[in-house]
């Protein structure tokens, strides 16, 4: 009887262990402002923190500026991007700005990139005001496969707010794929 | 044999009960507009509903204007803040507004406050238009410990939209800390 | 003894099966731009994709332009709505726009509609700029009962961005109702 019970317990222990090892993946990555590209055109942001302050990662990988999925599943993805300008930073090249974010998915198997979510606004940042600020938030629920990569593209990267509470993106697994 | 089976079933029953008691915490708090502070500078909003309309709370506590964590875990936090002004409400002091939200975390053990998320925009609300509106949304995934407190700070609180569908914040636990 | 063990295993198998059948519901619906209503007033958007590109649905139903809940629970709801205008599309009737989204819940039992979340902004889209863009994001945690329906209302539908990464809404179940 004990052997039988041990068998039952053991199988559940395996399940528990396996589910522990495969604990729900997540990531919250914050901007690394020491390496923000210049220019006003759309660029991919490759420098993010994954292990300081609010930044953290588990059962996902951060490599070459991309968040790599290690576990198939349905994930909630989100991004918060803040832009700002103070007159002491110098004059803007134009008052008419397109401040945008694009959250993209790349599959290595099929080397193609697709935009999952986009957001932003055209803004008129006139010289009459000494300070300008604007934030974008996007979020959505997506099926991600192991090996797929998530990256962030923005316009006007030189206007990004470098604070960890301002410019970040992340993901957490909600459920398995049936 | 029955005793053994009862033991196996019993231990799972305990686990089920315990997990039921420790059901995933959540909160969705909506603005209580009867007590909104004035001024244009950053203030902490302390009046929120937790048990009427869409507002609800479970396995978290609302006290002294702060959402208190009762269970360690990784939580998704979010806030939606709407600002509005109609000319019939009076004249604005300035057309150049900084409409901002800050979601902050306070630890009682280490009495310090840190901003987890911020969002907003500078806006030009001219007297030439009879109505103005603007909403901010922020969200992110954070590790929260029991006893930590979440609060909301905004600029220009007198411009807040008092509707429950407009100005609210919340949290729900996604997973345990390993 | 084997019979007892089979009984124990069987009951857990039932539980696993049942939980598999009742897998966490979700939906991510993207705008179907072939059928966007015109006008500038608030309208309900009824044409959404549920099974192409990023759009998907499981254990929820999409019918008559509404997302129908099949399983009681607490859900995270979200919407991302993008508006845009290029001068080549023609002249706007007014420069002063109210670009808004309303996420509403309808109960068939009590035929009434309530707004869960709203967001947006008043905008001044002047003819001095050839392109204008603006995105809204809202999200929140709500108790939904089987049979309740979620729908999306927007102002100025003719200005909607028809891309699947731009205009979408969704939901995923986070936990049961106690």
């Amino acid at each position: 009887i004990r052997a039988e019970k041990a068998m039952v317990d053991g199988s559940w222990l395996d399940l528990a262990k396996r589910s522990k090892l495969e604990a729900q993946p997540f990531a919250h990555l914050t901007i690394n402002a020491t390496d923000i590209p210049s220019g006003s055109h759309k660029v991919s942001l490759s420098s993010w923190y994954h292990d300081r302050g609010w930044a953290k990662i588990s059962n996902m990988t951060f490599s070459n500026g991309k968040l790599i999925v290690n576990q198939d599943g349905f994930y909630y993805l989100y991004a918060n991007i803040c832009f700002r300008h103070h007159e002491t930073s110098g004059d803007l090249a134009t008052e008419y700005l397109q401040l945008m974010v694009y959250v993209t998915k790349t599959s290595i198997k099929i080397p193609s990139s697709h935009t999952l979510m986009k957001g932003g606004s055209t803004k008129y940042w006139s010289g009459n005001s000494e300070f300008h600020f604007y934030s974008i938030n996007v979020g959505g629920f997506f099926k991600l496969r192991s090996g797929e990569e998530i990256s962030i593209e923005v316009s006007n990267p030189s206007l990004l707010d470098p604070d960890q509470d301002a410019t970040y993106f992340g993901a957490f697994k909600v459920r398995d794929i049936d | 044999i029955r005793a053994e089976k009862a033991m196996v079933d019993g231990s799972w029953l305990d686990l089920a009960k315990r997990s039921k008691l420790e059901a995933q915490p959540f909160a969705h708090l909506t603005i209580n507009a009867t007590d909104i502070p004035s001024g244009s500078h950053k203030v902490s909003l302390s009046s929120w509903y937790h048990d009427r309309g869409w507002a609800k709370i479970s396995n978290m506590t609302f006290s002294n204007g702060k959402l208190i964590v009762n269970q360690d875990g990784f939580y998704y936090l979010y806030a939606n803040i709407c600002f509005r002004h109609h000319e019939t409400s009076g004249d604005l002091a300035t057309e150049y507004l900084q409409l901002m939200v800050y979601v902050t975390k306070t630890s009682i053990k280490i009495p310090s406050s840190h901003t987890l998320m911020k969002g907003g925009s500078t806006k030009y609300w001219s007297g030439n238009s009879e109505f103005h509106f603007y909403s901010i949304n922020v969200g992110g995934f954070f590790k929260l410990r029991s006893g930590e407190e979440i609060s909301i700070e905004v600029s220009n609180p007198s411009l807040l939209d008092p509707d429950q569908d407009a100005t609210y914040f919340g949290a729900f636990k996604v997973r345990d800390i390993d | 003894i084997r019979a007892e063990k089979a009984m124990v295993d069987g009951s857990w198998l039932d539980l696993a099966k049942r939980s598999k059948l009742e897998a966490q519901p979700f939906a991510h619906l993207t705008i179907n731009a072939t059928d966007i209503p015109s006008g500038s007033h608030k309208v309900s958007l009824s044409s959404w994709y549920h099974d192409r590109g990023w759009a998907k649905i499981s254990n929820m139903t999409f019918s008559n332009g509404k997302l129908i809940v099949n399983q009681d629970g607490f859900y995270y709801l979200y919407a991302n709505i993008c508006f845009r205008h290029h001068e080549t599309s023609g002249d706007l009737a007014t420069e002063y726009l109210q670009l808004m989204v309303y996420v509403t819940k309808t109960s068939i039992k009590i035929p009434s509609s309530h707004t869960l979340m709203k967001g947006g902004s008043t905008k001044y889209w002047s003819g001095n700029s050839e392109f204008h863009f603006y995105s809204i994001n809202v999200g929140g945690f709500f108790k939904l009962r089987s049979g309740e329906e979620i729908s999306i209302e927007v102002s100025n539908p003719s200005l909607l961005d028809p891309d699947q990464d731009a205009t979408y809404f969704g939901a995923f179940k986070v936990r049961d109702i106690d």
Partner: nanobody
């Protein structure tokens, strides 16, 4: 140091007009809310008119609505009060005041303004 200097006061007959000016110096004028107050003999100082930093929002005390107009020229660091259809009860010392926008709405009380001019006398004879 903030300096506010009023001018344009004087003696005028009932029904007449005057234009008061207030020249500002020593601060970023466009960042300040401006207001006009007045104090009649034996009475407390009262709010007359206020104007937002950009000049598109204006507010008035009921007794001067449709008769007085406040305006500003941020390029000249000056705020104006155009007074028409003047009445003997408009007789008072008129003060220019300035404040940073510490409230969302136009401040209307004396204590909400940080900086004051010396005042200019307006006398309306019947």
């Amino acid at each position: 140091e903030v300096q506010l200097v009023e001018s344009g006061g004087g003696l005028v007959q009932a029904g007449g007009s005057l234009r008061l000016s207030c020249a500002a110096a020593g601060y970023t004028f466009r960042a300040y809310v401006m207001g006009w107050f007045r104090q009649a003999p034996g009475k407390e100082r009262e709010f007359v008119a206020g104007i937002s930093t950009g000049g598109t929002w204006t507010g008035y005390v009921d007794s001067v609505k449709d008769r007085f107009t406040i305006s500003r020229d941020n390029t000249k660091n000056t705020v104006y009060l155009q007074m028409a259809s003047l009445k003997p009860e408009d007789t008072a010392v008129y003060y220019c005041a300035a404040t940073t926008p510490v409230t969302s709405y136009l401040p209307r009380s004396e204590r909400q303004y940080e900086h004051w001019g010396q005042g200019t006398q307006v006398t309306v004879s019947s």
